[in-house]
């Protein structure tokens, strides 16, 4: 029979293991009703061709449904996750039906067999549709299919076998392994609903990727990058869960896209948003931050459907827990000169004053060489919402290139220690909020004093709004 | 009302077999799953498993592999725990009792157990 | 596997008195704010019946005079005011999210 083992190095050797030690199982898969949101509560099973239980149990034919599909289990149970995500939707919307598909005998296999068995259990769902599309006012385009890890290829094969077009599937960090670079019909895809949104949070471009790189939907949203997510790392995992496993780990951020969704429905106050961009890299130098032509979106269930939107590859910093949203900022600063700077790679570190709050200290992180007399643009997120911004204070500190350096600096303060020596010239720095896409520019405090040394401060106050230069007009931007 | 009835007590020697039944009333069998636990004389509880009374896949904690098999017979509400090669140390009261599949797995409800003795 | 520590092993209360047994795991039983852990009552030759669910959740027709607390690795069953029919052997359980589950070894309640 099935046993447990971890997600990550057993799931390697899983891949190839002799297909003699499957277990022999009774194909099946349960369609659950949650009647309630109750997490013990047995629900109601729906049984395609019988329409006393869509009666019985309080179907709804014209508002709105969710099937949530799990994916590969270890145990054969289901997930502490599940009841999260149905109770999310319960509170958000009320009149809603909520079907959990039960593969669970299917998905309790080698992952490959559970793999293989994707397609089998999408068609069984297709079918279910097909059949409620014979009932009144039951409308393919309220049909939300969500579907985790394994699941969200089975909504696709779901997507793709039914007659007519489901309104919306939602992949939350889709499995990586056998679906990297299938083809479309063997994977979850954008053809497979009138909208497919996806969330990636476990991705790795090196050892084996749990979730899905590529993008494969209308919108594909990387939380952090996709990669590592904050809150799970090992000394995260270590604090606050006591488990401090690899595992642990793994699960935790692999999961990490469902508990995104679930903040979506339940903090709807609180929305996060992502933003288009190329690749990882550009949007952590802030490169990324706009609205316009519709470059952002929410995320998770309040996700607005693009228009002619295909594998757009979306970003966005997350908080560790709930609610997840943060406030992005870009901030451009001019380095207007460097002084007896030598090997030295400066690091800086702002803080942001605003109306409502004030940040901690955050460091700018350093995707490529601070460049001199150039503008050199940082992505930085606060917790808070800080409001207006109203003043920046700034410093530095260097980061030696090598031993000898830093030996040359050590000596050179401590044979004049009240001499600086190295100094950067900066004379303002220029913010953009993503949030609100408002363009902000703040101006040195005391505009003959605008050199700083490392460890110093340097303050800067608003000076204007915009970025505006002679002839150059700032369109207006909605969020969605 | 619900209940989880037993079957009576065994008497067994080393080596032989035996099959306890768990037969369930006043919900719907297949809606729940199914566990074993294992309490010798004067010791605790020791969860040995549990069985999907749907798909009837049953799985085993690492100390009941091989000698212990979950079984069903579905149209009858009915569980079974078969123990194979009997050892001294099977001695003890089995119980079987249900759990929620949706929600935090607890034991809602119990059979009266069944207590196996093993004796040459 | 998480491990469940049961203590005191046994206690001896007087009637109407307060009885408290504590259970500490060797790893967090949190899930999300929700604790995946609950206690059982057992009496001789009795099989064990469910007191409190999800670390303070009472089952439907236990007596409010049982309470369950605690969060992450560190949990209490209270009693008050202790009554006759409460002698018992209190286990608690863990079951959160992939097996083994595990009892913890139980703590024997006398009545004094």
């Known amino acids: 029979s099935p046993t447990p083992f971890g997600p990550e190095g057993q799931l390697a050797d899983e891949l190839h293991k002799p297909k003699a030690i499957q277990t022999e199982v009774k194909p099946s898969v349960r369609f659950n009703l949650r009647t309630s949101k109750d997490p013990e509560h047995e629900g109601c099973y729906l049984s395609l061709g019988h329409s006393q239980p869509l009666e019985d149990c309080g179907f709804n034919m014209t508002a709105k449904t969710f099937f949530i599909i799990h994916g590969w289990t270890m145990s054969g149970i289901f997930e502490n996750w599940l009841h999260k995500l149905v109770s999310a939707l319960h509170t958000r919307e009320k009149d809603a039906n909520v079907v959990v598909v039960d593969w669970l005998p299917l998905a309790h296999q080698l992952y490959t067999d559970a793999v293989n068995n994707t397609r089998v259990v999408g068609h069984s769902i297709a079918r279910m549709l097909d059949w409620l599309q014979e009932k009144d006012d039951f409308s393919l385009g309220n049909v939300h299919l969500i579907g985790y890890s394994l699941g969200a290829h089975v909504a696709g094969y779901a997507g793709n076998f039914v007659k007519g077009t489901v309104g919306r599937i939602t992949g939350l960090d889709p499995a990586g392994p056998m679906f990297e670079g299938a083809d479309i019909h063997k994977r979850l895809s954008p053809d497979d609903a009138d909208f497919v949104d996806v969330l990636h949070t476990y991705t790795r471009s090196f050892g084996l990727s749990i979730g899905i790189q590529m993008p494969v939907g209308h919108i594909d949203i990387y939380p952090n990058g996709g990669d590592f997510q904050p809150g799970c790392g090992l000394n995260d995992v270590l604090g606050s869960m006591a488990y401090g496993t690899i595992t642990e780990v793994v699960k935790c951020e692999h999961e990490r896209a469902v508990h995104l969704f679930v903040d979506s429905l339940v903090n709807q106050d609180k929305p996060s948003f992502a933003f288009q961009c190329t690749d990882s890299n550009r949007f952590k130098k802030g490169i990324c931050l706009s609205c316009r032509k519709n470059r952002c979106n929410s995320i998770g269930y309040n996700a607005k459907k693009m228009r002619n939107k295909r594998n757009s590859k979306m970003y966005l910093k997350t908080r560790a827990g709930m609610p997840f949203r943060v406030y992005h900022y870009q901030m451009k600063i001019h380095v207007f000169s460097y002084k007896n700077m030598g090997e030295i790679e400066p690091t800086f570190y702002v803080t942001l004053y605003g109306t409502n709050a004030d940040s901690q200290t955050l460091p700018l992180e350093i995707v490529e060489r601070i460049e001199q007399n150039a503008t050199n643009t940082f992505l930085v997120y606060t917790e808070e919402d800080l409001g207006d911004l109203l003043k920046i204070q700034l410093t530095w500190e260097g980061a030696s290139q090598s031993w000898y350096n830093l030996w040359k600096e050590l000596r050179s303060y401590l044979s004049q220690p009240h001499n600086p020596g190295r100094e950067l010239n900066i004379r303002r720095i220029r913010v953009k909020s993503g949030e609100t896409q408002r363009k902000l520019t703040f101006c040195a405090e005391d505009p003959e004093n605008t050199s700083i040394s490392p460890g110093r401060e340097l303050w800067f106050r608003k000076c204007r709004d915009g970025w505006r230069m002679k002839n150059e007009t700032s369109p207006t931007v909605e969020l969605p | 009302q619900i209940q989880l009835v037993q079957s009576g007590p065994e008497l067994k020697k080393p080596g032989e077999t035996v099959k306890i039944s768990c037969k369930a009333s006043g919900y719907t069998f297949t809606n729940y799953g199914m566990n074993w636990v294992k309490q010798a004389p004067g010791k605790g509880l020791k969860w040995m498993g549990w069985i999907n009374t749907y798909s009837g896949v049953p799985t085993y904690t690492d100390d009941f592999k091989g000698r212990f098999a979950f079984s069903l017979e579905t149209s009858a509400s009915t569980a079974f725990l078969q123990i194979n090669n009997l050892k001294n140390e099977d001695t003890a009261t089995y119980f079987c009792?249900?759990?929620?599949?949706?929600?935090?797995?607890?034991?809602?409800?119990w059979g009266q157990g069944t207590t196996l003795t093993v004796s040459s | 596997d998480i491990v469940l520590t049961q203590s005191p092993a046994s206690l001896a209360v007087s009637l109407g008195q307060r009885a408290t047994i504590s259970c500490k795991a060797s790893?967090?039983?949190?899930?999300?704010?929700?604790?995946?852990m609950h206690w059982y009552q057992q009496k001789p030759g009795q099989p064990p019946k469910l007191l409190i669910y999800a670390a303070s959740n009472l089952e439907s027709g236990i007596p409010a005079r049982f309470s369950g607390s605690g969060s992450g690795t560190d949990f209490t069953l209270n009693i008050h005011p202790v009554e006759e029919e409460d002698a018992a052997t209190y286990y608690c359980?863990?079951?959160?999210?992939?097996?083994?589950?595990?009892f913890g070894g139980g703590t024997k309640l006398e009545i004094k």
């Open positions: 359980q863990q079951t959160n999210d992939d097996p083994p589950w595990t």
């Open positions: 790893q967090s039983v949190d899930y999300d704010g929700d604790s995946y």
């Open positions: 009792a249900r759990f929620s599949y949706y929600g935090r797995h607890y034991f809602d409800y």
